[in-house]
């Protein structure tokens, strides 16, 4: 049993002269959510103010796959992107101030994997570093929910229904209500990744209409109404 | 000694925001992580998140994430959440707690120094 | 995220006599790039805020008495109180640090009996 203080951790802290980067070993964040890689770091080059390059690579240390680079010019706070796929990486920290974390929208099962950070000053002060273990992000799959049900007019004083969901892996979509064989009538199409949206094109009955959302962790419903009216065609939702 | 000064008990409507100030002395603001963690009645701990406030860098628990916001201020080295659209349910103790040293080799992020705790209440 | 539960919710053990709280994650906290578990227990007495007590499971915090110790590795833990003392009635948490978001313990409430 071993005894510390951390009150004055200054005594287990970095040296001034040498490299180190600190991440979390793993990040959680369910599907269809952002999640944070944290990533700080101390470096030998004291007030280094120097042009700076920004990296974030997945999968292998050092010959991983970038997915994220920027640049910062000489004096500035301001790292400048060059490199986001997918467009859903940015990053939060500054580097400047020893902080290259960095955020990941719109997550997939797909993203869910170890990720590396890297700083390069490109000066005069010319060094480098990266981290060698990296953080895990583990995205877990996510329940069903219905993000958007509604009625919309369509053509020849017809309506129409549309219910987005979102889930990982993607849910399955049905539609129910008062017309015989109506769930057959509902047309799917794929939303991007973690969404999808299905569409019943012709409401010719009044009454409610029920959205319902499944993947493998559960499902979700959702409903709307319909209520036309003989003066004016209109809907209840 | 390390020390973290919290604002004093606030009661707010639903709907309303608050935001809760923490002065920190006894050490350098900018080396460690701060953390707001929020106690309802009778319950246990629950981590909302943390701001770095050397490079002002945040990172919110997912169920916070678009209702939470931590700030600082390093000129009179203080860390701020405010929380909006409240809720009965936010009604609890508000706690900074201090984190990791943000120069130590390990991600040795736990929470050595805690505030005196600001009580929420949301009420009607 | 990952799921801390504590055994047992409340402990009533007489003075001088030992205390054990367990604590079990849904998934393990032990690091294999430092061989170390991320865990950490918190001491909270009535109106107070937690206090640290353990970090990285066993290492115990400047000013804790000796006798309170932490072992366990993976996903299961023990804080133990080899001489209970009046001072020590309180509510203790496990925490771990090891995967964002950061998850406590439900508590473990220790009296006197």
């Known amino acids: 049993d071993a005894s510390g203080d951390l009150l004055n951790t200054e005594a287990h802290s970095a040296p001034a002269q040498r490299w180190s980067m600190q991440v979390p070993a793993e990040v959680n964040a369910e599907a269809g959510d952002a999640a944070v890689l944290p990533c700080t770091f101390t470096h030998p080059h004291r007030h280094y103010d120097g042009p700076l390059t920004a990296i974030w690579r997945s999968g292998e240390p050092y010959a991983g796959p970038q997915v994220f680079r920027c640049t910062a010019a000489p004096g500035s706070e301001l790292c400048q992107t060059a490199l986001s796929l997918h467009g859903r990486f940015r990053l939060l920290g500054n580097p400047r101030r020893n902080d290259l974390s960095l955020r990941v929208e719109r997550l997939a099962l797909a993203d869910s994997g170890r990720y590396f950070c890297r700083v390069e000053f490109t000066g005069d002060a010319h060094d480098r570093y990266e981290s060698r273990h990296g953080v895990r992000l583990r995205v877990t799959a996510a329940a069903p929910r219905i993000v958007n049900i509604s009625v919309l007019p369509g053509p020849a004083h017809a309506f129409r229904a549309l219910c987005t969901a979102e889930g990982e892996p993607p849910p399955a979509l049905a539609w129910s209500g008062p017309a015989p064989g109506n769930s057959s009538a509902a047309l799917q199409g794929q939303g991007h990744g973690y969404q999808v949206t299905a569409e019943l094109p012709a409401l010719t009955r009044d009454g409610r209409y029920t959205c319902t959302a499944a993947n493998s962790l559960g499902r979700a419903e959702a409903s709307v109404y319909l209520f036309r009216f003989h003066g004016a065609p209109g809907t209840s939702t | 000694q390390v020390q973290l000064v919290q604002s004093g008990a606030e009661v707010k409507k639903p709907g309303a925001s608050v935001k809760v100030s923490c002065k920190a002395s006894?050490?350098?603001?900018?080396?460690?992580?701060m953390h707001w963690v929020r106690q309802a009645p009778g319950q246990g701990l629950e981590w909302m998140g943390w701001?770095?406030?050397?490079?002002?860098?945040?990172n919110y628990a997912q169920r916070f994430q678009g209702r939470v916001t931590m700030t600082r201020d390093t000129s009179i080295s203080t860390a701020y959440m405010e929380l909006s659209r409240l809720r009965s349910d936010d009604t609890a103790v508000y706690y900074c707690a201090r984190g990791r040293l943000l120069r130590f080799f390990d991600w040795l992020d736990v929470m050595d120094a805690w505030g005196q705790g600001t009580s929420v209440t949301v009420s009607s | 995220d990952i799921v801390m539960t504590q055994s047992p919710d409340s402990l009533a053990v007489s003075l001088g006599e030992r205390a054990t709280i367990n604590c079990k994650s849904s998934?393990?906290?032990?690091?294999?790039?430092?061989?170390?578990?991320?865990l950490a227990w918190y001491q909270q007495k009535p109106g107070q805020p937690p206090k640290l007590l353990i970090y990285w499971a066993s290492t115990r915090e400047s000013g804790v008495p000796d006798r309170f110790s932490g072992s366990g590795s993976g996903t299961d833990f023990t804080l133990t109180i080899s001489s209970l003392q009046a001072e020590d009635v309180a509510v203790y948490y496990c925490?771990?640090?090891?995967?964002?978001?950061?998850?406590f313990g439900q508590g473990t409430k220790l009296e006197i009996k």
């Open positions: 925490q771990q640090y090891y995967s964002i978001p950061y998850t």
């Open positions: 701001i770095n406030p050397n490079s002002d860098g945040t």
């Open positions: 998934r393990s906290v032990l690091y294999s790039s430092n061989n170390k578990n991320y």
């Open positions: 006894g050490y350098t603001f900018t080396d460690y992580y």
